[in-house]
Structure formats: structure tokens, C-alpha cells
Interface confidence: medium
């Protein structure tokens, strides 16, 4: 009897959908695996007789529930199927956006770039899929614990009237208000403000 794949899960970030599993202990030799997806009531092969422990399902429709399954094989024997259900638009992890930060005197000027989507047009981003897409920006004075959050209305934001000659750190994530779904934070970017540009009269 061939044991089934273990710890079967979908690792999906920005709609790059990778079904992953672990090979079970099997004394007779090396196992291969076949992964399939349900399409119009019929299971279709996606990865056949692979020695890998993952299979790329990024071409699935972003909408609706998909049934995926994987089994282990050895010679003419095979394990039972292990099934999972996956809805990309609900289940994919929102990866960190890009961010450009520029210091202008006592202000930080930030521009945000929504994560690109795998297997789509060059210009296609997560904003194109989620119409409520917005950004959360979190910033703090370097070395302090108190953090502040803002929700920019656009793809850019300016933090004004900051303390001069002080290092501020900023990070951004995507957020979907209509789903209460938060993405991953970007790595913090820390920049030092310069002087206050106001000229004393």
C-alpha cells in the first residue's frame, strides 16, 4: 500500500498558486506524484509522475472554489487522493507592495506600487483584481515603539512637518476594506529628515 502525500497545502502569494506537500516515508523506493484539478466535473492532470513535492496552479481562474488533489505513486501502485479546496481571490496572500521614499526637508514623500500578479499582463497588479484595494502606511520615529497608521487615498502620500534631522521608518501593505483582509508589510524604509524649510521672518 502506497501512503498518501502529507501536509498538503496551497502556498499562494499574489495568485502564484503552488500546491505543496511532503513525501511520506516509503521503504520500497522513491515515490512520484500526480496532481490534478477539477474542471467541469472532470479531474485534469496538472503535474504527472513528478518527483517534485509541488505543482504550479497559477493558471487557475482567480474566482470560485477549485478542488485540487494529489496522490503518491510507486510502480503500478498508488495512494488515495488527498483533496483540498482553494479559492484564489479569497485565499491568496497579498504580498508586500513596493515603496519609493524621498526626503524633502522635513517631509517624507512616498509612492506605492501594488504587487504584480503572476502570469498576467506586465501592467496587471493586485489593484486590478480587488476594486477596494487601498494601502495601509505605518510609520514611526526610529528607536521608538509608538507607531502611527494612515490610509492614503491615492498611490502616494506625504508625511509633513516631521522633526528635522530625525530618522523615520515607514512600511506599507495592501488592505481590502470590503474583506477586512490585510497583506504583508513591506520591509521598513528608514530615512533621515533634514532641516525645516520655513524661513524665520
Amino acid at each position: 500500500m502506497v501512503p498518501p502525500p502529507e501536509n498538503v497545502r496551497m502556498n499562494s502569494v499574489n495568485f502564484k498558486n503552488i500546491l505543496q506537500w511532503e513525501s511520506p516515508a516509503f521503504a520500497k523506493g522513491n515515490l512520484t506524484f500526480t496532481a490534478q484539478y477539477l474542471s467541469y466535473r472532470i479531474f485534469q492532470d496538472k503535474c504527472m509522475n513528478t518527483t517534485l513535492t509541488e505543482c504550479d496552479f497559477s493558471s487557475l481562474s482567480k474566482y470560485g472554489d477549485h478542488t485540487l488533489r494529489v496522490r503518491a505513486e510507486f510502480a503500478d501502485e498508488h495512494s488515495d487522493w488527498v483533496n483540498i479546496t482553494f479559492c484564489p481571490v479569497d485565499d491568496t496572500i497579498i504580498g508586500p507592495p513596493g515603496m519609493q521614499v524621498e526626503v524633502l526637508a522635513d517631509s517624507l514623500h512616498m509612492r506605492f506600487l501594488a504587487p504584480k500578479i503572476e502570469n498576467e499582463y506586465e501592467t496587471w497588479t493586485m489593484k486590478n483584481v480587488y476594486n477596494s484595494w487601498t494601502y495601509n502606511v505605518q510609520y514611526w520615529k526610529n528607536g521608538t515603539d509608538e507607531k502611527f497608521q494612515i490610509t492614503p487615498q491615492y498611490d502616494f502620500e506625504v508625511l509633513r512637518n516631521l522633526e528635522p534631522w530625525t530618522t523615520y521608518c515607514v512600511q506599507v501593505r495592501g488592505f481590502l476594506p470590503d474583506r477586512n483582509k490585510a497583506g504583508e508589510w513591506s520591509e521598513p524604509v528608514c530615512e533621515q529628515t533634514t532641516h525645516d524649510e520655513t524661513v524665520p521672518s
Partner: nanobody, 111 residues
């Protein structure tokens, strides 16, 4: 860790009003925007109303013009004023903030 606790649910007649509250506790310094969601039996969770940091609001289509989201000055409590309630407003109402959920409060609209 932030905790969200809803209150104010109950049974109300169609056409009536109800006001829900959601109190946030824990590390709320970054909790500037919060919203209300609901889940009716056999349906998926949907947006009711959301309030952003700057006071902007966003509402789900079924409740526009009837429900209003507001918050206190400390921003640690958010309210949902529900007017002209309909039978189809019956659901469990959840408070949500940046991926965190409250436990929900039941609202039942009777005829």
C-alpha cells in the same frame, strides 16, 4: 494584540432601529480604521460599512442610506447605527479592523 468586542445586538421589529458598538482594546495605537461586516445563514461575510483614518466611509450596497458608521473621538470604539431595518438584515454582525475580527453579535429582524 488587539481585541475587538461587539455589543448591542438583539431582536428588533422590521422598520425599527438598533445601534451596535465595537470596542477595541490592546495595542490600539495603529488601529485607526475599522469596519462592520455581517454574515447571514448560508451566505458569505459581506461589508456593511467601513470608516477610514481620515473619516471617509464606505458602505455595502444593501445598506446604503439606512446604516451609518461613526466612531468616538478616542477612535477605540466604532458604532453602527441601523435604521429602517429589514428582514434581510438578519445576520451575525462582526467588527473588523486590519485583518482582526470580533466574535460577532446577532441581529434578528422580525416581522
Amino acid at each position: 494584540q488587539v481585541q475587538l468586542v461587539e455589543s448591542g445586538g438583539g431582536v428588533v421589529q422590521a422598520g425599527g432601529s438598533l445601534r451596535l458598538s465595537c470596542a477595541a482594546s490592546g495595542s490600539t495605537s495603529t488601529l485607526d480604521h475599522m469596519g462592520w461586516y455581517r454574515q447571514a445563514p448560508g451566505k458569505s461575510r459581506e461589508l456593511v460599512g467601513y470608516m477610514f483614518t481620515d473619516g471617509r466611509t464606505q458602505y455595502g450596497e444593501p445598506v446604503k442610506g439606512r446604516f451609518t458608521v461613526s466612531r468616538d473621538n478616542g477612535r477605540n470604539t466604532i458604532f453602527l447605527q441601523m435604521n429602517n431595518l429589514k428582514l434581510e438584515d438578519t445576520a451575525v454582525y462582526y467588527c473588523g479592523a486590519q485583518g482582526i475580527w470580533g466574535q460577532g453579535t446577532q441581529v434578528t429582524v422580525s416581522s
